[in-house]
Interface confidence: low
Amino acid sequence: GTDSGSEVLPDSFPSAPAEPLPYFLQEPQDAYIVKNKPVELRCRAFPATQIYFKCNGEWVSQNDHVTQEGLDEATGLRVREVQIEVSRQQVEELFGLEDYWCQCVAWSSAGTTKSRRAYVRIAYLRKNFDQEPLGKEVPLDHEVLLQCRPPEGVPVAEVEWLKNEDVIDPTQDTNFLLTIDHNLIIRQARLSDTANYTCVAKNIVAKRRSTTATVIVYVNGGWSSWAEWSPCSNRCGRGWQKRTRTCTNPAPLNGGAFCEGQAFQKTACTTICPVDGAWTEWSKWSACSTECAHWRSRECMAPPPQNGGRDCSGTLLDSKNCTDGLCMQNKKTLSDPNSHLLEASGDAALY
């Protein structure tokens, strides 16, 4: 503790001009009291005949100092080291606006040197976040902002973000950006960014987790192209035909909107009816030919086949023997292009 009256330390010592002013090899550093653990402050100086701590403007009792002395190998000068402990109680007993501070004063024959002030603070981290991230549903490729204001703390809490319990490292995944005010930005939401996000605040006292925010990256559905129209339902006359499309271009995902509109279209259709062909009446029999045959013919024209109707079945020509005709000797064949049917004449012999 400090002792303001029982000991009086000299303001200076007799000087010897050959010795320089004390120089601090180690100055006391700012420290935080965690829970009830006292902190240790340390000074090293040379040349130094004495080193004492002063806290909040008052000398610390000599009994509370632990002093060591040794030679500095490089210079051969005498190095003095001193340390004190500061307890939580001491810090709490300091009332006022100023933080608890301590500094070292070192003496040599040349005079005194003061170290920097080291501040001792009671470390804490409040439980509640000033702002916690909120879950959201976002379209694919959109920017997402997750906000986090960590709890008040001494020292000020550091913030990191977890994605499904894994620490986000923006240097590894440049789609993530951590802002100076601890917010997380997802630049272009990917489907793989659908996850639980947690803001974690930590300092030397504790680690606090925010509530978890669920980010869902969704894809709204889009229609595929229409399929071809189906064939008309009736082969002949009036009927219906339909076509379909599907909500797969892309398919909706993670609660994205289903396509609006019809997946099915129906329209009336008329197919011209096919007309099957039919034969005309047979022609009259021809006169008896030189081959002793006569012929008759017909055509598939009553009506002709139309719109994919069936052709007539059967023969175009019909023939049969005849005995009433005069059959010529050395007769020509029907296949001869000069052949012709001869009428019976008086020059021909009767059979």
């Epitope: 694919l140 659908t194 797969t248 398919a251 609660g255």
Partner: antibody
Framework: EVQLVESGGGLVQPGGSLRLSCAAS????????MHWVRQAPGKGLEWVAS????????SYADSVKGRFTISADTSKNTAYLQMNSLRAEDTAVYYC????????WGQGTLVTVSS | DIQMTQSPSSLSASVGDRVTITCRAS??????VAWYQQKPGKAPKLLIY???SLYSGVPSRFSGSRSGTDFTLTISSLQPEDFATYYC????????FGQGTKVEIK
């Protein structure tokens, strides 16, 4: 007409590997969420893995993560499930299905893991 | 992961009965829930998507509804061909199915 046909199932020893194929016709798998769903004998349906080629996205059930890999060859309009380090509990009929609401399913292919 | 708790696991009913099957999501899944029918040895068939939309070709006696995270499949008048196992499924990745409800003849 939309059709999904699975193949590649069979008997395999524990620790072995199999590759299942799902040949799709009548639609483009590039734009469709494709799933593998399995059903162990006498049990319910269990989602295994999904791929969404449109967004280069894959997702797996915890039970198969690190062992199974889903992929798609959009030029062949076929999805695949590469199954490594197979266990007895992977024995099931494996179905492939299309869409986020699974509107079309294949007939299924049986995978038996047994020594 | 989101759990889908389906009930009952089985039920006995007669032709003409009204049948209700429910699924509760462990967290919000918006309306991204589908219902399937499966018969032994066959692949499942989609009945309802987006919680309440009837899939094309499915008879109108099937309907779906949502109340918060509770989802219901209703068969208004059970037909002989409706005896099967029914599953709900949520479409937030990772996808999960309910445990199934077997509808048997009383």
């Amino acid at each position: 007409e939309v059709q999904l046909v699975e193949s590649g199932g069979g008997l395999v020893q524990p620790g072995g590997s199999l590759r299942l194929s799902c040949a799709a016709s009548g639609f483009n798998i590039y734009y469709s969420y494709m799933h593998w769903v399995r059903q162990a004998p006498g049990k319910g349906l269990e989602w295994v893995a999904s791929i969404y080629s449109y967004s280069s996205y894959t997702s797996y059930a915890d039970s198969v993560k690190g062992r199974f890999t889903i992929s798609a060859d959009t030029s062949k309009n076929t999805a695949y499930l590469q199954m490594n380090s197979l266990r007895a509990e992977d024995t099931a009929v494996y179905y492939c299905a299309r869409h986020y609401a699974m509107d079309y399913w294949g007939q299924g292919t049986l995978v038996t893991v047994s020594s | 992961d989101i759990q889908m708790t389906q009930s009952p696991s089985s039920l006995s009913a007669s032709v003409g009965d009204r049948v209700t099957i429910t699924c509760r999501a462990s967290q919000s899944v918006s309306s991204a829930v589908a219902w399937y029918q499966q018969k032994p040895g066959k692949a499942p068939k989609l009945l309802i998507y987006s919680a309440s939309s009837l899939y094309s070709g499915v008879p109108s006696r099937f309907s779906g509804s949502r109340s918060g995270t509770d989802f219901t499949l209703t068969i208004s008048s059970l037909q002989p061909e409706d005896f099967a196992t029914y599953y709900c499924q949520q479409s937030y990745s990772p996808f999960t199915f309910g445990q199934g409800t077997k509808v048997e003849i009383k």
